[in-house]
Interface confidence: low
């Protein structure tokens, strides 16, 4: 880091004095300070001398010495006050330009540090600062207006109390420029519009910018529309509004409308589509299959998309049977609006019970009439199995009834010993029944099938098992003969109802 001699942070001298500032570094060094007259510069290798033999108030300022070759970019500084009783202020610039919300430094430097206690900032001709002007003072740098606003673009003076009276600096003009981040901000409402032929419509195109210099126009299918413009200024922004009012729309009014605004930064445009229809419409659709299959106990969300104009006057979900008389709970129905003319309606069916299978209809109404979309919900069940022993045409028969959805497949197993379920080691014989007889197959109900296994003699120390399975699961029933030769006693009466 370079070193300055004299090695003090600030130096106070009188006008006309000789001042010598010497900077020494490891390599070559450079001085940087306020532009002022009467300085001479002498450099000798790793040192540089800045000197004047006639200091004036204009030499007041901070002088910084840097070592360009230093990778750490170190520097040293000294502040020089040239204490002029007639001139308390050294103004380094008479015009300051900043963008809105930046800090604006008004560079009036105090020539005498003793005066710091009585300084203030005023507007020219003694006018007070605008309300909410937030500022601070540094004797080395001047007044800083923090987060300057466009409205603070004024002429300012720095004031110091000298001998009981206020002494003003020359004026400094502050120009606070609006930050034009880009082209004007645009709104075009509505974002989408549908009207029935003969109805009224309104399209509003508005643009706003921090700067008044911008243009805005509305065009229909690439044709610029001649619409009177309303102008306004609020929230520190200029607004220009174009309103297209159509008393009775017709098909030629339909099409693409673009709102276009431009300024020096460029052009912005936004579009909307206006649809003119002959009559009210109401369309229901679903991305889901209208035929749904769900395992009992699981949940399902039924979703319907609605496109409608005019808006819906009513909608609801209805259970159409065939089981209980229950209706979907309103709290399970949910509606979300995608935009003005499109909505999504969801019916949540958690933990489905057997009585909840059947048809669910979503019903919507608008002035165009009623529409309905019906879902068919079938529940899947794992098979339930039962086996009985009976006689059919004099032959001993094991009769297995399996009920589930989808339709269960049936397999018979014969295994040694008495067991609840045949394992591989015990199996003596396996019969697949590819075509069990379907006993009942009603929509939304379980399918019940029946499989017969003719057994001439029931083996006493054996188990006969009927297994059924479908895509949901499996079920089985083990039949253990009570005594050998049971086949010889056909029942007096046989009635089997699955």
């Amino acid at each position: 880091i370079p070193v300055i001699e004299p090695s003090v942070p600030e130096l106070v001298v009188k006008p006309g004095a000789t001042v010598t500032l010497r900077c020494v570094g490891n390599g070559s060094v450079e001085w940087d300070g306020p532009p002022s007259p009467h300085w001479t510069l002498y450099s000798d290798g790793s040192s540089s001398i800045l000197s004047t033999n006639n200091a004036t108030f204009q030499n007041t300022g901070t002088y910084r010495c840097t070592e360009p070759g230093d990778p750490l970019g170190g520097s040293a500084a000294i502040h020089l006050y040239v204490k002029d009783p007639a001139r308390p202020w050294n103004v380094l610039a008479q015009e300051v330009v900043v963008f809105e919300d930046q800090d604006a430094l008004l560079p009036c430097l105090l020539t005498d540090p003793v005066l710091e206690a009585g300084v203030s900032l005023v507007r020219v001709r003694g006018r007070p600062l605008m309300r909410h002007t937030n500022y601070s003072f540094s004797p080395w740098h001047g007044f800083t207006i923090h987060r300057a606003k466009f409205i603070q673009s004024q002429d300012y003076q720095c004031s110091a109390l000298m001998g009981g009276r206020k002494v003003m600096s020359i004026s400094i003009r502050l120009k606070v420029q609006k930050v034009i981040p880009g082209p004007p901000a645009l709104t075009l409402v509505p974002a989408e519009l549908v009207r029935i032929r003969g109805e009224a419509a309104q399209i509003v195109c508005s643009a706003s910018s921090v700067d008044v210099n911008f243009d805005v126009f509305l065009q229909h299918n690439n044709t610029k529309l001649a619409i009177p413009q309303q102008s306004d200024f609020h929230n520190n922004r200029y607004q220009k509004v174009l309103t297209l009012n159509l008393d009775q729309v017709d098909f030629q009014h339909a099409g693409n409308y673009s709102c276009v605004a431009s300024n020096v930064q460029g052009k912005h445009s936004t579009s909307m589509f206006f649809r003119v229809v002959e009559s009210a419409y109401l369309n229901l659709s679903s991305e889901q299959n209208l035929i749904q299959e769900v395992t009992v106990g699981e949940g399902l969300n039924l979703k319907v998309m609605v496109e409608a104009y005019p808006g819906l006057q009513g909608f609801n979900w209805t259970y159409l049977g065939p089981f209980s008389d229950h209706q979907p709970e309103p709290k399970l129905a949910n509606a979300t609006t995608k935009d003005t003319y499109r909505h999504t309606f969801t019916l949540s069916l958690p933990r489905l019970k057997p009585s909840e299978a059947g048809r669910y209809s979503f019903l919507a109404r608008n002035p165009g009439g009623w529409r309905a979309l019906t879902f068919e919900l079938t529940l899947r069940y794992p098979p339930e199995v039962s086996v009985i022993w009976t006689f059919i045409n004099g032959s001993g028969t094991l009769l297995c009834a399996a009920s589930g959805y989808p339709q269960p497949n049936v397999t018979w197993l014969q295994c040694s010993g008495h067991t609840d379920r045949c394992d591989e080691a015990q199996v003596l014989q396996v019969w697949d029944d590819p075509y069990p007889e379907v006993l009942s197959q009603e929509p939304f109900h379980k399918v019940t099938v029946q499989s017969l296994l003719t057994v001439e003699t029931l083996e006493h120390n054996q188990t006969y098992e009927c297994r059924a399975h479908n895509s949901v699961g499996s079920g089985s029933w083990a039949f253990i003969p009570i005594s050998a030769g049971a086949h010889t006693h056909p029942p007096d009466e046989f009635l089997f109802t699955p």
């Epitope: 609801n316 209805t318 209809s361 019903l363 165009g368 009439g369 009623w370 309905a372 019906t374």
Partner: antibody, heavy 118, light 107 residues
């Protein structure tokens, strides 16, 4: 089970007003999605929708007969009433009421024949 | 109002025949179409709704198809009890309207 029965005069004179009552059971007209329609059929001719009332008490009428028709309901009595003014011999027809669900007339009354004659 | 037309207006057929009746709407009605059967002196009976869905209890020999403006009712194997007049009805927009009917009688 669902039943509907039409009642009203069998004979009306020209220019008179016809009042028909549909009494139903097995469903409620306060259930959403439920409607009752009146449909008529002149002898040997096609069916014609006259009017429909829904659970929300919204009413829909035949375009050509709109000015002559009024439909109303009494949910507590399970009744729907149709009145038709300024009767003419061409209005001679069998008048049916039907339960209409989601726009579909799934249950019908047996119909009542109304003759318009002086 | 939407106008419904049916063809033919009447025809003769024998039991066992395959019978096709067509119905046309004056504008698109999606699948909002029902078919009814009416026998003399009786009220109409709902056969098919949503263009192709069979009403419960209706024999499977009846079937419906179509969407938009053109629809068909088919009786795959005509039975003696099927001799009647058949009406189509749109329920796409109010007022709901019926076709003029197609009478199927014994040849």
């Amino acid at each position: 089970q669902v039943t509907l029965r039409e009642s009203g005069p069998a004979l009306v004179k020209p220019t008179q007003t016809l009042t028909l009552t549909c009494t139903f059971s097995g469903f409620s007209l306060s259930t959403s999605g439920m409607c009752v329609s009146w449909i008529r059929q002149p002898p040997g001719k096609a069916l014609e929708c006259l009017a429909l009332i829904d659970w929300d008490d919204d009413k829909y009428y035949s375009t050509s007969l709109k000015t002559r028709l009024t439909i109303s309901k009494d949910t507590s009595k399970n009744q729907v009433v149709l009145t038709m003014t300024n009767m003419d011999p061409v209005d001679t027809a069998t008048y049916y009421c039907a339960r209409t669900q989601l726009g579909i007339a799934d249950y019908w009354g047996q119909g009542t024949l109304v003759t318009v004659s002086s | 109002a939407i106008r419904m037309t049916q063809s033919p207006s009447s025809f003769s057929a024998s039991t066992g025949d395959r019978v096709t009746i067509t119905c046309r709407a004056s504008q698109g009605i999606s699948s909002y179409l029902a078919w009814y059967q009416q026998k003399p002196g009786k009220a109409p009976k709902l056969l098919i709704y949503a263009a192709s869905t069979l009403q419960s209890g209706v024999p499977s020999r009846f079937s419906g198809s179509g969407s938009g403006t053109d629809f068909t009712l088919t009786i795959s194997c005509l039975q003696s009890e099927d001799f009647a007049t058949y009406y189509c009805q749109q329920y796409y927009s109010y007022p709901f309207t019926f076709g003029p009917g197609t009478k199927v009688d014994i040849k």
